[in-house]
């Protein structure tokens, strides 16, 4: 199947991806076309835009040329200037600022906690199955199978540290070689990037916001996929990661030291352990073929236990099973021996919600999955709302300048590397790349950070998570120290190699272009985002897993033709865009294929048909929520929530007016402006920090 043309161009003409739109009017209250060169992308930035989405009110303005949808929007400052405020207004403004900061930190805290609970939920739902993936003996001989197992397990348990720790314990127990573990680690790296992609889906309401957020999140995915695409064959051929890490491990005489510091967990753990606590050892035990673990619950019941070593008389089937001949006897009926038995005495139960419910793991997992996704979504909406109200005018300018501006010439190239270090440092502090990249996603969405700047931050995050793993390895007990350190180093050098491949030379920054391409498609066809998620993180790995189980001949038999078609399509696409004259007229575009094979339009029609019946109730629900939100925020009565979004979209699209999907992330002031209701906000409602 040929690729859809939208994939080819990361920065296409918006007429390509704006349904029914040929031009667009940027929302600029002062009607100026002033540009702002604070951005390292060196593209014009209009003072204010919500591209390519619109307020539901038609803005009568002269048609102008469409701006680049990847430009950062200038968040309009609708507040009174500080100098124009009276003393009471200033005090109120300060308190309002402090209140917003507290709220922001609060929602950020619950956002991180919900990510932790989400990981626990995934482990409860798919942890045991994930553990069983590891017990497949073919991993040793098939690196591709190892890779997809790494992806699937990490996706199922929503934690690369869990899958990595399983691999470490398996290597330490000689159930797995370091060579066989490397592809699993690569897969775990891919799997961990799903979290921020899920977070990006929460911003689906606003097309332009979603475009940026989704591209910002998937830049991580593409970096990992492309790194694996190049480095896995290199590793299989040369075993460079294994060799380099072995040399490092053998050249140092490590002593296992202190535990790796738990920085963010110190704050989040007291809350998350009231929700649920898991016995992570169960998944590892299943991975190691421990039959008894299959019937154990992952939900931890006893938090305080006393383990006592005692000598006990135990029966054995024959003398051969005796501890030693002198420690064996018969009572005439059975043969007995004396063994050291660890007797575990339960002292105190855990203090989480599910401790006394005795629900099956799947039920607890589903409950937590729903709750954590709702909390995650709610927190994200509130974070975006608060940031939207705080990051206006001069504040936004200062922040955007700080984050997105390069160092002066000739040190501009250093900016990205500093961003990598910042990303690594921040990830080390929060002890999770998922948390860091997920926190980054809404900031990209609302336009605080460009994708070009988010990319090195994400790469740094990948490095940060491996330094955490190295520290954890150094703190591990003697029997697992070598293997855990070697695997952590493999992870580290894999990410370093990936950065060297896809960052230093701007031309090689393919993940940015690919992510922008995907962002454009997903903004136009929002269902494609979920489709992408399912295909890349579930279907492809599961298919490869299935084919690998069938054996090499089947895998090669199916894989080679598929890879050949993909290469053929890519080459054709490259020739179509670079030198179409080389190709015969028929191959200069994809029109020779049926429409469904080179465009998403027919697919969109099919999906719309299926999702149609669900849009009305969903819309009504959205309207109710929106009304509540409007009441809380003090929106006018004529807030667009009062009319069902579906009717609005259909009606306005019929008139050729592009519509902005009803979304709770909107700037209230813009809505008022659009409805001709702009009034000077009194000091009670609106406030600007500078």
């Amino acid at each position: 199947m040929a690729p859809w043309p939208e994939l080819g161009d990361a920065q296409p003409n918006p007429s390509k991806y704006l349904e029914g739109a040929t031009s667009q009017q940027p929302i600029t209250p002062d009607k100026s076309k002033e540009t702002n060169k604070t951005d390292n992308t060196e593209v014009p930035v209009t003072k204010f835009e919500l591209l390519p989405t619109y307020s539901t009110a038609t803005l009568i303005e002269e048609p102008t040329e469409v701006d680049d949808p990847w430009n950062l929007p200038t968040l309009q400052d609708s507040g009174i200037k500080w100098s124009e405020r009276d003393a009471k207004g200033k005090i109120l403004c300060v308190f309002q600022g402090i209140g917003r900061l507290i709220l922001l930190l609060g929602f950020l805290y619950f956002f991180v906690c919900s990510l932790d609970v989400l990981s626990s939920a995934f482990q409860l739902v798919g942890g045991k199955m994930a553990g069983q993936f590891f017990s497949n003996s073919s991993i040793m001989s098939n690196p591709l199978l190892g890779l997809v197992i790494g992806v699937l397990v990490t996706v199922f348990v929503q934690s690369s540290s869990t899958s990595t720790s399983i691999v470490v314990s398996m290597v330490a127990s000689s159930l797995l070689t370091v060579r066989a573990a490397i592809p699993i680690i690569m897969g775990a790296n891919i799997g961990t990037s799903i979290t921020n992609t899920i977070v990006a889906l929460m911003q689906v309401g606003d097309r332009s916001e979603f475009r940026r957020a989704f591209a910002g999140a998937t830049v991580h995915d593409f970096f990992n996929w492309l790194s694996v695409l190049v480095l896995l064959p290199v590793e299989v051929a040369t075993h460079y990661l294994e060799v380099v890490t072995q040399l490092i491990v053998e050249s140092f005489h490590f002593k296992n030291g202190e535990d790796a510091p738990d920085l963010l967990k110190v704050i989040t753990k007291p809350f998350t352990k009231l929700i649920v606590q898991l016995d992570k050892k169960v998944i590892s035990q299943i991975a190691m073929n421990d039959e008894t673990a299959k019937n154990k619950s992952l939900v931890k019941i006893w938090c305080k236990t006393f383990t006592n070593m005692t000598q006990m008389n135990v029966t054995v089937p024959s003398m051969a099973n005796c501890t030693s001949p002198s420690l064996c006897w018969t009572d005439g009926i059975q043969i007995w021996t004396m063994k050291n038995v660890t007797y575990k005495e339960n002292i105190a139960k855990c203090q989480h919600i599910f401790v006394n419910f005795h629900l099956p793991d799947l039920a607890v997992g589903i409950i937590l999955l729903i709750i954590s996704l709702l909390v995650l979504c709610g927190c994200l909406i509130m974070i975006v709302k608060i940031l939207g109200s705080v990051l206006k005018g001069q504040v936004a300018t200062v922040i955007k300048k700080t984050i997105n501006t390069d160092f002066p010439f000739p040190f501009a190239w250093l900016t990205g590397y500093l961003a990598i270090l910042v990303g690594a440092g921040m990830t080390f502090i929060v002890q999770s790349s998922s948390v860091f990249t997920s926190a980054l996603t809404p900031l990209i969405g609302i336009g605080v950070i460009t994708i070009e700047r988010a990319y090195p931050l994400t790469l740094g995050s990948n490095i940060g998570t491996t330094t955490t793993a190295i520290l954890a390895a150094l703190a591990s007990p003697g029997n697992t120290l070598r293997s855990s350190l070697q695997i952590a180093l493999c992870h580290f050098f894999f990410n370093i190699s990936g950065i060297l491949l896809w960052y230093p030379i701007p031309f090689t920054r393919l993940p940015i272009r690919m992510a922008k391409g995907l962002g454009n498609i997903s903004a136009k066809y929002r269902w494609f985002a979920i489709f992408y998620l399912i295909i890349f993180f579930f279907l492809i790995p599961l298919t490869v897993f299935g084919l690998s189980l069938a054996g090499w001949p089947v895998l090669v038999g199916v894989g080679v033709p598929v890879v050949f078609i993909i290469i053929l399509v890519l080459c054709l696409r490259l020739l179509q865009s670079r030198c179409p004259r080389v190709l015969p007229k028929k191959l200069q575009n994809w029109n020779f294929l049926p429409l469904c094979m080179h465009s998403l339009k027919p697919w969109d029609a099919v999906i719309s048909k299926f999702t149609g019946p669900f849009q009305m109730p969903c819309c009504c629900c959205c309207r109710v929520c929106c009304r509540v939100c409007c009441l809380l925020c003090g929106c006018p009565k004529c807030c667009r929530c009062s009319k069902c979004c579906q009717d609005l979209e259909e009606g306005q699209e019929a008139q050729g007016v592009p519509v902005k999907a009803p979304e709770t992330f909107d700037n209230i002031t813009i809505s008022r402006e659009a409805q001709g209701e702009v009034r000077a906000p009194d000091s009670k409602t609106e406030c600007t920090a500078l």
Epitope: N313, P325, S326, W329, T330, D331, I333, I335, W336
Partner: antibody, heavy 121, light 107 residues
């Protein structure tokens, strides 16, 4: 005091079966293993098997599997040994002896007086 | 099965003599060895448990020693009531086995 009472003699026909008893007293019958030992006149001792009255577990020496069957009646604190297909070679003394608790090494602190089985036509 | 070999088969002594009866195991049995005395027309009586521990009510002239494969029952001063058969028994390995016995007789 601990006592194990056995009938002094049993006379049986060749090919027939005999069920001899061993009545225990002076201790908790279900807590200790009862062993059966064979002794030919002027010969050594040979272990036949054992039964744990607490749960009815039994164990037999390879030589006596199918030949001997051990049972216990908790209500009367009596252990039984049934010998099948008797021949003249089975005309020996059979002792019951109290072993130790379940799981403790087997040694016999208390013995019955023994039952002399005579196989004759 | 573990084979216990007792020697001598017969031991002729006079009262007041010191005697040693030997029991050798075909493989190591730790200290799971017991000594029994059986007088004519009587049931066996346990003398020594765990190779060296005397049972209560047993005269102090009886003592046991050894571990592994070689065991000895010693009678410091033989008295007339001590004559009879002496058997050793092991419970280290299933099944329980007895030695063929040593006959202690009056010289």
């Amino acid at each position: 005091q601990v006592q194990l009472q056995q009938p002094g003699a049993e006379v049986v026909k060749p090919g027939a079966s005999v069920k001899m008893s061993c009545k225990a007293s002076g201790y908790t019958f279900t807590s200790y293993i009862i062993h059966w030992v064979k002794q030919a006149p002027g010969q050594g001792l040979e272990w036949i098997g054992a039964i744990y009255p607490g749960n009815g577990d039994t164990s037999y020496s390879q030589r006596f599997k199918g030949k001997a069957k051990l049972t216990a009646d908790k209500s009367s604190s009596t252990a039984y040994m049934q010998l099948n297909s008797l021949t003249s070679e089975d005309s020996v003394v059979y002792y019951c002896a109290r072993g130790n608790n379940y799981g403790s090494p087997a040694w016999f602190g208390y013995w019955g007086q023994g039952t002399l089985v005579t196989v004759s036509a | 099965d573990i084979v216990l070999t007792q020697s001598p088969v017969t031991l002729s002594v006079t009262p007041g003599d010191r005697v040693s009866l030997s029991c050798r195991a075909s493989q190591s049995i730790g200290n799971f060895l017991y000594w029994y005395q059986q007088k004519s027309h009587e049931s066996p009586r346990l003398l020594i448990k765990y190779a060296s521990q005397s049972m209560s009510g047993i005269p102090s002239r009886f003592s046991g020693s050894g571990s592994g494969t070689d065991f000895t029952l010693s009678i410091s001063r033989v008295e007339t009531e001590d004559f009879g058969m002496y058997f050793c028994q092991q419970s280290n390995s299933w099944p329980v086995t007895f030695g063929a016995g040593t006959k202690l007789e009056l010289k």
